[in-house]
Amino acid sequence: VPRWRQQWSGPGTTKRFPETVLARCVKYTEIHPEMRHVDCQSVWDAFKGAFISKHPCNITEEDYQPLMKLGTQTVPCNKILLWSRIKDLAHQFTQVQRDMFTLEDTLLGYLADDLTWCGEFNTSKINYQSCPDWRKDCSNNPVSVFWKTVSRRFAEAACDVVHVMLNGSRSKIFDKNSTFGSVEVHNLQPEKVQTLEAWVIHGGREDSRDLCQDPTIKELESIISKRNIQFSCKNIYRPDKFLQCVKNPEDSSCTSEI
């Protein structure tokens, strides 16, 4: 008799999830010599232990603590780049500006980026059919709790000037319900962070509006100022040129506004 299985509203675990996590870990430790001591099998065991045999709506930050310990890493606290709804450009930027880090440039972020996972209560099976959706099913699911945990700790680690890349093409350039708006903003440490600098990325080539005056940016400024952190904002009118100028800052066209 086939065993009844809970149907969740979200997509199931990414196919070949264990192999993907293990392969990413090996690749990361090869690319980053300072992490070559990491035992990727132990990392996978700790990752698996966070959600296997547990109800996928009852995951806690504590479940991920063994994985957090194994992912210990040096991140220059004044070189942190946060992002919201514009991940690809943020990652393109840190691939060029190698001394800056997004969360996905760390081992833990790299392991989990774009993956979905969940298990089932009381069985050692990974659920490849469906996983809980944050809105429709539950917020304390394995993926959401993981990103909330690492995002909070990443924000807590930041110091001096913290940068955030925001998508100027969205109706809400700053969204209070995003991971940045709901977790990272509130976990920046005012005693360590002097300034949050927002980079608002424009979408249209002819878009010359000052999106730093957008009501949602003003809302972000208000939240940050109330936390005794200074706020500044820059328009990035030409993201393609912006990246090109990061690559070749001596280019004569890079002295003008981008």
């Epitope: 957090m68 992912g71 991140v75 990443f154 110091c159 005693e191």
Partner: nanobody, 117 residues
């Protein structure tokens, strides 16, 4: 600005003890969880232990559990690590850092602990 100064390291025989101290300044010490991390020669960073601001919550790496004790004195802005039953594999530079990790940017020079007979 967060500043820390670690001290108390030295050369000790296997089975011996040391007490590390970390004097912190530039922030409200009692509000911050603190950690000890270490880096063995030619190895990466390893988290050792963490303690909450009030000292109500404490955690240890499996490799040091039962041998090391973390504590803090908020009136002196100082973090401690009592290390007993030291082993050769505990040889490392020990750093204190704010937060519980996994992301650290340690501000001090660290203190070298060498365990050798």
């Amino acid at each position: 600005e967060v500043q820390v100064l670690e001290s108390g390291g030295g050369l000790v025989q296997p089975g011996g003890s040391l007490r590390l101290s970390c004097a912190a300044s530039g922030f409200t010490f009692s509000r911050f969880a603190m950690s000890w991390v270490r880096q063995a020669p030619g190895k990466g960073l390893e988290w050792v232990s963490a303690i909450s601001g009030s000292a109500g919550s404490i955690d240890y790496a499996d490799s040091v559990k039962g041998r090391f004790t973390i504590s803090r004195d908020n009136s002196k802005n100082t973090l401690y690590l009592q290390m007993n039953s030291l082993r050769v594999e505990d040889t490392a530079v020990y750093y204190c850092a704010d937060g519980t990790g996994p992301f650290f940017d340690y501000r001090g020079q660290g203190t070298l602990v060498t365990v050798s007979s």
